[in-house]
Amino acid sequence: LEASEEVELEPCLAPSLEQQEQELTVALGQPVRLCCGRAERGGHWYKEGSRLAPAGRVRGWRGRLEIASFLPEDAGRYLCLARGSMIVLQNLTLITGDSLTSSNDDEDPKSHRDPSNRHSYPQQAPYWTHPQRMEKKLHAVPAGNTVKFRCPAAGNPTPTIRWLKDGQAFHGENRIGGIRLRHQHWSLVMESVVPSDRGTYTCLVENAVGSIRYNYLLDVLERSPHRPILQAGLPANTTAVVGSDVELLCKVYSDAQPHIQWLKHIVINGSSFGADGFPYVQVLKTADINSSEVEVLYLRNVSAEDAGEYTCLAGNSIGLSYQSAWLTVLPEEDPTWTAAAPEARYTD
């Protein structure tokens, strides 16, 4: 069960190429996401002639223009130029809308605003800026996990946020490990949750005009310790032709942090087993579960020598589990290969 919220990319608004010169009105405090070109090959964004860096509050990144929270100084002309040329892919002007929303505590310290300017904007009671990110109200997470509750909001004046647990002010002082309040993200983070963290968590967002609140319910599941569980049938016996690529897959489920190894069974002095009765193996890959792609063993350009038995071995503090599969490698010219087994890869 995932407790902490997934990182969601805002829908990317791509201005049409037929309207190369256009104006977009953006409300203050609103995030901006604009596309230009395709992902890695996307164009470079410029503001008033200066190229935007790939990091920072306002950034040009992988063909995207991203502004975390639109401020008055972000208004102006933006160009997107094709990589390696001066071809203009986008030409647009961002205009400041008339509602002031929340500032972002992460913003560049250089961008100061005169608080007196705020009164030129209409006052507005707090409101949720991303209610879709708050849809998950009931959280049930294993003990030890990290939980993050978010209540992204805005208003004028910029509202404050405070948290209640079971209706009482919550600062985490009685909680081992405390809590992290990230006001710029409107979030409450609790690491290594325990059963005493169960309860109703309320974010209370207030300004001079009004207040709003939202409830989350947290249950903490006590772990029943067990050794890693491997999905049945994986890795799967696989047949491949010489020169092809092979993927062996191993799905591991474990509460306690598991450690995974891919092993190839080998023969030493004509024997597959040592005097201790254990098989001779060669360790091909080893990592923790949260390493990328550790559950997949890639074999590139296989040869006859790659044929044999492969084992996925997973261990945690409670014990070990393993499952094995055989790789059969056929010669390139074998006609039965083409007829019977055209797909070299195991697919999930």
Partner: antibody
């Protein structure tokens, strides 16, 4: 396919007790908040109680507080409602329902009728 | 506790007509509102959650809208199987509360 099957209803005298069960199948029961909702004859829906996946959190409607106890056995995929000190106004069809992560009730059982009468 | 008020309490319409059912909360419940349909002798069935998202398998003629305190359920063209009682339910805060229901009858 998600299925919820209530049982244990029947006729009981005022002041008596009953234990309702709800057998769940087709989903990982131990991950879901579960709720009991009742409906008196010819009336609307009234929430009775909910329980968290671990059983460590429970909540009751004021009308049943102190008399009803919700519990669950995750090893048996079963939800329970122990009803004591029953009153005539507890007469209703009792439904168990699964709460989605967003707290709406996405699956309901067919209900079991509890009649409290002398 | 939050109060949920549905209107009208009953509605008599012919097949093919458009039905609009209302639900009002006594205080803001954001978009944490569900709509349920109940036919005689059956359990309720979830139609809409999050004020406007149709549950799995619910026909497109059912549309939910609203946020805060005012919500509505619209059935664009009534079919014979749509005649039932409709309940709204808030799940923004505990206790969860249902409206008293709107009975939709054949005219």
């Amino acid at each position: 396919e998600v299925q919820l099957l209530e049982s244990g209803g029947g006729l009981v005298q005022p002041g008596g007790s009953l234990r309702l069960s709800c057998a769940a199948s087709g989903f990982t029961f131990s991950r879901y908040f579960m709720k009991w909702v009742r409906q008196a004859p010819g009336k609307g829906l009234e929430w009775v109680s909910w329980i968290s996946p671990s059983g460590g959190l429970t909540e009751y409607a004021d009308s049943v507080k102190g008399r009803f106890t919700i519990s669950r056995d995750n090893s048996k995929n079963t939800l329970y409602l122990q009803m004591n000190s029953l009153r005539a106004e507890d007469t209703a069809v009792y439904y168990c329902a699964r709460a989605s992560y967003g707290a709406w009730l996405d699956y309901w059982g067919q209900g079991t009728l509890v009649t409290v009468s002398s | 506790d939050i109060q949920m008020t549905q209107s009208p309490s009953s509605l008599s319409l012919s097949p093919g007509e458009r039905a609009t059912l209302s639900c009002r909360a006594s205080q803001s419940i954001n978009r944490n509102l569900g709509w349920y349909q109940q036919k005689p002798g059956q359990a309720p069935r979830l139609l809409i959650y999050g004020a406007s998202t149709r549950a799995t398998g619910i026909p497109a003629r059912f549309t939910g809208s609203g946020s805060g305190t005012e919500f509505s359920l619209t059935i664009s063209s009534l079919q014979s199987e749509d005649y039932a009682i409709y309940y709204c339910q808030q799940y923004d805060n505990w206790p969860i509360i249902f409206g008293q229901g709107t009975r939709l009858e054949i005219k």
